[in-house]
């Protein structure tokens, strides 16, 4: 029962984790104008992975997609490829881990195949956590350092008379959701391995002992026990899937005539 | 079409109160925000701020703070800008202004005369 | 504060002429985030409210006549009437919109020579 809750509980964990992951990498919060110590401006900018967005005071918001691949910076793609394969693992992990399931029966899956799914889709959701706290991380990094440089020039004179403020860069939400969301990843993975020595079959070999009766002889040869693959009494199939429902900043839109975005 | 009616001219004594009134239509109120201007007889045009419509929120330029306060009554669908104290120096035309792309001033009322007078 | 500084303070051009007026700002109103210059130009006739004629420095507002023309970037603008008609007597103002407040110019008075 303890191996088939911390299975179950294993899975959800890291289904939760990899649907952080994938709103982490769709979100374009990945690095947010620092309003700290800055001039009031009347624009708010913000930096995704894959799209940099402008919101004015008057609520409207323009995106422009990244639509160079060789022009970007090499941290940048980094980041992409580092989310983007820890998608792809979590994803596998996960259609892997539905089918190791204990309470879920595929035909006459045996328990020792169970387990080494079990296993291999703990290990995907490790691999798949550590890529999205790498790349997150990364990010976090290349922030610290621009934040920093921007900082010493953060007013560069033109001739000593005009100002030219330098746009600093902060921590977005979406490293946050990055990073929660690769944790539980990990743990959820750990879980999953955690719950794989559970299902292993113990094979405790006895040797035959022969007891001899009157009248006729009977051979009592103990075999293995086999853990019973019998079904939990929960056998409804929950979505715990969280969409990550978004709350807008409360700010002016702008339904002009000409909306265009 | 997008339309915003102000009230009319005003005159007051100095130390009395005025509010002016900005009527929108033809939008959804909420979704502009409100600016106020100020333009002196024969002089420029001076940005007050401005209210967020939705939250509420106002921006005051330096200058604007205390006597000066920016207000609206979703329902009425109106901004008001209520000044207090009055003194000589505040005679002007006040226009109310929704923000447009570029944080421009897309929509002006038509302006309000307040004459300050003893 | 942003300081916005035009020039000239009146104007004198003869109809069918191009009128010039410049903005220059105390600091830059280029954003960098989407590459847009924060400053809009309006009109304004004798008792009547201003009026929106340029955003983000050369964008034309839907009904301007194509005459006005708006370029610059950064700290420097200026607003263009390729050939002035008589109608386009006016007072000519920039206006800052990347900083609070948004500060206006003191004005250019364009009259017909």
């Known amino acids: 029962m303890a191996v088939t809750a911390c299975q179950g509980l294993g899975f959800v964990v890291s289904l939760i984790g990899i649907a952080g992951i994938i709103a982490a990498t769709c979100m374009d919060q990945w690095s947010t104008q620092d309003l700290y110590n800055n001039p009031v401006t009347a624009v708010f900018n913000y930096q995704g992975l894959w799209r940099s967005c402008v919101r004015e005071s008057s609520g409207f918001t323009e995106c422009r997609g990244y639509f160079t691949l060789l022009g970007l910076p090499a941290m940048l793609q980094a980041v992409r490829a580092l989310m983007i394969v820890g998608i792809v693992l979590g994803a596998i992990g996960l259609l892997v881990s539905i089918f190791a399931l204990k309470c879920i029966r595929i035909g006459s899956m045996e328990d020792s195949a169970k387990a080494n799914m079990t296993l291999t889709s703990g290990i995907m959701f490790i691999v798949s956590g550590l890529c999205a706290i790498a790349g997150v991380s990364v990010f976090a990094n290349m922030l610290v350092t621009n934040f920093w440089m921007s900082t010493a020039n953060m007013y560069t004179g033109m001739g000593g008379m005009v100002q030219t403020v330098q746009t600093r860069y902060t921590f977005g939400a979406a490293l946050f959701v990055g990073w929660v969301a690769g944790g539980l990843t990990l743990i959820g993975g750990v879980m999953m391995c955690i719950a794989c020595r559970g299902l292993a079959p113990e094979e405790t070999n006895y040797k035959a002992v022969s007891y001899h009766a009157s009248g006729h002889s009977v051979a009592y040869k103990p075999g293995g026990f086999k853990a019973s693959t019998g079904f939990g009494s929960n056998t409804k199939n929950k979505k715990i899937y969280d969409g990550g429902a978004r709350t807008e900043d409360e700010v002016q839109s702008y339904p002009s005539k000409h909306d265009y975005v | 079409q997008i339309q915003l009616v102000q009230s009319g001219s005003e005159l007051k004594k100095p130390g009395a109160s005025v509010k002016v009134s900005c009527k929108a239509s033809?939008?959804?109120?909420?979704?502009?925000?409100m600016n106020w201007v100020r333009q002196a007889p024969g002089q420029g045009l001076e940005w007050m701020g401005w209210i967020n419509t939705y939250t509420g929120e106002s921006t005051y330029a330096d200058g604007f703070t205390g006597r000066f306060v920016f207000s609206s009554d979703t329902s009425a669908r109106t901004a008001y800008l209520q000044i207090s104290s009055l003194k000589a120096e505040d005679t002007a035309v006040y226009f109310c202004?929704?923000?447009?792309?570029?944080?421009?001033?897309?929509?002006w009322g038509q302006g309000t005369l307040v004459t300050v007078s003893s | 504060d942003i300081v916005m500084t035009q020039s000239p303070d009146s104007l004198a051009v003869t109809t069918g002429e191009r009128a010039t007026i410049n903005c220059k700002s105390s600091q830059s109103l280029l954003n960098s985030g989407n590459q847009r210059n924060y400053l809009t130009w309006y009109q304004q006739k004798p008792g009547q409210p201003p009026k929106l004629l340029i955003y983000w420095a050369s964008t034309r507002e839907s009904g301007v006549p194509d005459r006005f023309s708006g370029s610059g970037s950064g700290t420097d603008f200026t607003l263009t009437i390729s050939s002035l008609q008589a109608e386009d007597v006016a007072v000519y103002y920039c206006q800052n919109n990347y900083f609070y407040p948004f500060t206006f110019g003191q004005g250019t008075k364009l009259e017909i020579k």
């Open positions: 033809g939008y959804t109120f909420t979704n502009y925000g």
């Open positions: 202004a929704t923000l447009g792309y570029g944080n421009s001033l897309a929509y």
